[in-house]
C-alpha cells in the first residue's frame, strides 16, 4: 500500500522500566523484571525478566542500570537467547568507588543488532544481590525497530 | 516509486567490532581496526582503521570502548576526515582508578551528525599503547542512516 | 502523498551544543543554554535553556555532559515541562574522584519518549555552579523523531 506521511515514520518502539530485581540463590547474577513505559507497535513483548521478539529485524537496543554498590566493578550484560543458544550483544562496565556515599553510577550502553523471531532479550547483572536503584529514570531498557 | 512496507524501514546500518588496536611510534594515540558484525545497505565501508562514507547524509553514530588501564583518564575521540580537514564529532572521557584490579570501565557516547561522501570516520584513543579490551560486546562502533 | 525514496528517511533531527551554563543564586542547579549544531525539520526549537517541541511524537533523546568537578557525584537530569507539570525522563549519574587532576568524566544517557506539542525539554545539573566542560564534542543534546 501507498504509505501516508504518518505511516512513514512508525518505527516500533518499546521503552521499559523496572518492576523489581532478584537474585537466584544458586546463581551469581541479578536479573531485572521489566514493564512497558512506552510502546508503539506489536513486535515486542515484555515477559517477566525478558523481552520476547515477535517481529524479526534490525533493532537499536539500549540499556541503562543505576548502581549503588561498592563492589569494585559493576555493570550489565544484554543478551539474547533463541534457537537453542545464548549470545551476549553488549555490556556496560563501571568501576565503583569503595566508599558507600560515593558509590553511585549509571551505566549506559546501546547498539544495533539483528534479532530473530522468538528471541528473548534480557539484562543481567553478573553479581548476586547487586544493589540497584530501580528508579524508572535511572534504570531502563529500550528497543527501536529500524 | 511507491514504497512498500518493507522498503519504508530500510535504514542503512553498520555495527563494527574490533580486529586489533595499534599505536604509532610518533604519536600519542591508539587506533582501532574494525570489521563489520552487522551490515545493511551499501553506504558505509569498513576500511582498516576507519569507515568510509559512500552515501552522504545524517547518521546516528555510536562508539564504545572498554578500557583496562590505570592512566588517570581514558577515553575515545570519534572524528571525521574529509575535504582536507579533520573534525572531532564527539568524545567520551572516563576517570580511571589507580588500582589495576579496579581499572575497568566502558565508555559509551553517541550523536547525530551530517557526514559527507568520502569522509573517513575513525575512533582514536589519545594515549599510546592504551590497554583496551577488544571483546566485541565491550568495544564497538556503529552507524544508522536516518 | 506518495513518499519518494528521499522523503522516506527524513526523520526530524536536532543536535545541540552549549552556549553557556549558569546557576541561579537561589537554586541548587546549573542549567545549560543550547544552540543548534545540526537541524533537519521544523518540529524542534532551541529556546534559551530549553528546547520547545512543536511537533508531537515519539523521539529518541540523548544527552551528554562533560564534568570537571570533584563533587562526589555529578550528573544531569533530562526533563520535560508541559501541560502544567514537570516529568523527569532520564538521568545520568557519575561518581567523581576527589582529586581535581582526575575529576574528569563524561556522562551519556538516552532513551525513547513521547513528547507533546508545547513541551519544553531541559538538561539540569542538580548542583549549583557545577564545573562543566562546554566543548561541543564533550557536552551536547540531541533529538531524533522516530
Amino acid at each position: 500500500a501507498v504509505l501516508t506521511q504518518k505511516q512513514k515514520k512508525q518505527h516500533s518502539v518499546l521503552h521499559l522500566v523496572p518492576i523489581n530485581a532478584t537474585s537466584k540463590d544458586d546463581s551469581d547474577v541479578t536479573e531485572v523484571m521489566w514493564q512497558p513505559a512506552l510502546r508503539r507497535g506489536r513486535g515486542l513483548q515484555a515477559q517477566g525478566y525478558g523481552v520476547r521478539i515477535q517481529d524479526a529485524g534490525v533493532y537499536l537496543l539500549y540499556s541503562q542500570v543505576l548502581f549503588q554498590d561498592v563492589t569494585f566493578t559493576m555493570g550489565q550484560v544484554v543478551s539474547r537467547e533463541g534457537q537453542g543458544r545464548q549470545e551476549t550483544l553488549f555490556r556496560c562496565i563501571r568501576s565503583m568507588p569503595s566508599h558507600p556515599d560515593r558509590a553511585y553510577n549509571s551505566c549506559y550502553s546501546a547498539g544495533v543488532f539483528h534479532l530473530h523471531q522468538g528471541d528473548i532479550l534480557s539484562v543481567i547483572i553478573p553479581r548476586a544481590r547487586a544493589k540497584l536503584n530501580l528508579s524508572p529514570h535511572g534504570t531502563f531498557l529500550g528497543f527501536v525497530k529500524l | 516509486a511507491v514504497l512498500t512496507q518493507k522498503q519504508k524501514k530500510q535504514h542503512s546500518v553498520l555495527h563494527l567490532v574490533p580486529i586489533n588496536a595499534t599505536s604509532k611510534d610518533d604519536s600519542d594515540v591508539t587506533e582501532v581496526m574494525w570489521q563489520p558484525a552487522l551490515r545493511r545497505g551499501r553506504g558505509l565501508q569498513a576500511q582498516g582503521y576507519g569507515v568510509r562514507i559512500q552515501d552522504a547524509g545524517v547518521y546516528l553514530l555510536y562508539s564504545q570502548v572498554l578500557f583496562q588501564d590505570v592512566t588517570f583518564t581514558m577515553g575515545q575521540v570519534v572524528s571525521r576526515e574529509g575535504q582536507g580537514r579533520q573534525e572531532t564529532l564527539f568524545r567520551c572521557i572516563r576517570s580511571m582508578p589507580s588500582h589495576p584490579d579496579r581499572a575497568y570501565n566502558s565508555c559509551y557516547s553517541a550523536g547525530v551528525f551530517h557526514l559527507h561522501q568520502g569522509d573517513i570516520l575513525s575512533v582514536i584513543i589519545p594515549r599510546a599503547r592504551a590497554k583496551l579490551n577488544l571483546s566485541p560486546h565491550g568495544t564497538f562502533l556503529g552507524f544508522v542512516k536516518l | 502523498a506518495v513518499l519518494t525514496q528521499k522523503q522516506k528517511k527524513q526523520h526530524s533531527v536536532l543536535h545541540l551544543v552549549p552556549i553557556n551554563a549558569t546557576s541561579k543564586d537561589d537554586s541548587d542547579v546549573t542549567e545549560v543554554m543550547w544552540q543548534p549544531a545540526l537541524r533537519r525539520g521544523r518540529g524542534l526549537q532551541a529556546q534559551g535553556y530549553g528546547v520547545r517541541i512543536q511537533d508531537a511524537g515519539v523521539y529518541l533523546l540523548y544527552s551528554q555532559v562533560l564534568f570537571q568537578d570533584v563533587t562526589f557525584t555529578m550528573g544531569q537530569v533530562v526533563s520535560r515541562e508541559g501541560q502544567g507539570r514537570q516529568e523527569t525522563l532520564f538521568r545520568c549519574i557519575r561518581s567523581m574522584p576527589s582529586h581535581p587532576d582526575r575529576a574528569y568524566n563524561s556522562c551519556y544517557s538516552a532513551g525513547v519518549f513521547h513528547l507533546h506539542q508545547g513541551d519544553i525539554l531541559s538538561v539540569i545539573i542538580p548542583r549549583a555552579r557545577a564545573k562543566l566542560n562546554l566543548s561541543p564534542h564533550g557536552t551536547f543534546l540531541g533529538f531524533v523523531k522516530l
Epitope: - | D28, T71, I93, R127, A128, R129 | K131, N133, S135
Partner: antibody, heavy 121, light 107 residues
C-alpha cells in the same frame, strides 16, 4: 613546589640541531604531559607539541613534524626537545610547560624559565 | 588550525582603571580557553583556565568569561604589577593555538 628548570642558552649554525632539556620537580613526573612552546623575538607563542612521560609518546604540531623529536627520561624526571635542520627563523625562546595527562582540555599551569636558541651563520 | 584573534593589540590604561581584553576563536572551542600573563624576559604565567577559573594565587581582580567563540579577560582595578602582555589560548583542538597578545601599558 612545582619547578621546571631548563638548560642554558644555545647558539647554532643553520642546518644544525639543538636539544633542550627540562628538569621537573615537586610533582609526579609521569602524571602530566610536558608541552613545548616557542616564542620568536617580539612575537607570540607557538605550540610545538608535547611528550607524555607515562608512555614516552609524543604529540607534535604538524608544522614541526619531521624536524622535532620530544623524549623523556622518567628516572631523571626530565623532558627533552630536539629540533633539527635549524633555520634563522627558529631563533626563539623555547619553553617547556606542564599540562595534565589527558592533554586536551587542560591548560599549561607551570612553565620553565625558557631557553634562548639563536640560529646564526 | 583555530585562529585566536585578540583585541586590542595594545592598551594604554592607568592604575585603578577597569580594562577588558577580548579574544575571538575562529570556531567553537567551548570553554577550553586559558589566559596567560607575560612580563618582559619571563615565562608566561597562567591566570585563567576553563575560560573563567582563576588559577590558585591569582588576585580576584582578574576574571574571565565567555564560551564558544568569544572570550574576555577583565582586570577590575589595574595595579602597577599588572602592566604586561596577555595571551589567550585555546586547548580544545590540536594544535593548541594562542592569540597574538595584548600589551597593556601605562598611559
Amino acid at each position: 613546589q612545582v619547578q621546571l628548570v631548563q638548560s642554558g642558552a644555545e647558539v647554532k649554525k643553520p642546518g644544525a640541531s639543538v636539544k633542550v632539556s627540562c628538569k621537573a620537580s615537586g610533582y609526579t613526573f609521569t602524571s602530566y604531559v610536558m608541552h613545548w612552546v616557542r616564542q620568536a623575538p617580539g612575537q607570540g607563542l607557538e605550540w610545538m607539541g608535547y611528550i607524555n612521560p607515562y608512555n614516552d609518546a609524543p604529540k607534535y604540531n604538524e608544522k614541526f613534524k619531521g624536524r622535532v623529536t620530544m623524549t623523556s627520561d622518567t628516572s631523571a624526571s626530565t623532558a627533552y626537545m630536539e629540533l633539527s635542520s635549524l633555520r634563522s627563523d627558529d631563533t626563539a625562546v623555547y619553553y617547556c610547560a606542564r599540562g595534565l595527562g589527558y592533554a586536551l582540555y587542560y591548560a599549561m599551569d607551570y612553565w620553565g624559565q625558557g631557553t634562548t636558541v639563536t640560529v646564526s651563520s | 588550525d583555530i585562529v585566536m584573534t585578540q583585541s586590542p593589540s595594545t592598551l594604554s590604561a592607568s592604575v585603578g582603571d577597569r580594562v577588558t581584553i577580548t579574544c575571538k576563536a575562529s570556531q567553537n572551542v567551548g570553554n577550553n580557553v586559558a589566559w596567560y600573563q607575560q612580563k618582559p624576559g619571563k615565562a608566561p604565567k597562567l591566570l585563567i583556565s576553563s575560560a573563567s577559573n582563576r588559577d590558585s594565587g591569582v588576585p580576584s581582580r582578574f576574571s574571565g568569561s565567555g564560551s564558544g567563540t568569544e572570550f574576555t579577560l577583565t582586570i577590575s582595578s589595574l595595579q602597577p604589577d599588572d602592566f604586561a602582555t596577555y595571551f589567550c589560548q585555546q586547548y580544545n583542538i590540536y594544535p593548541f593555538t594562542f592569540g597574538q597578545g595584548t600589551k597593556l601599558e601605562i598611559k
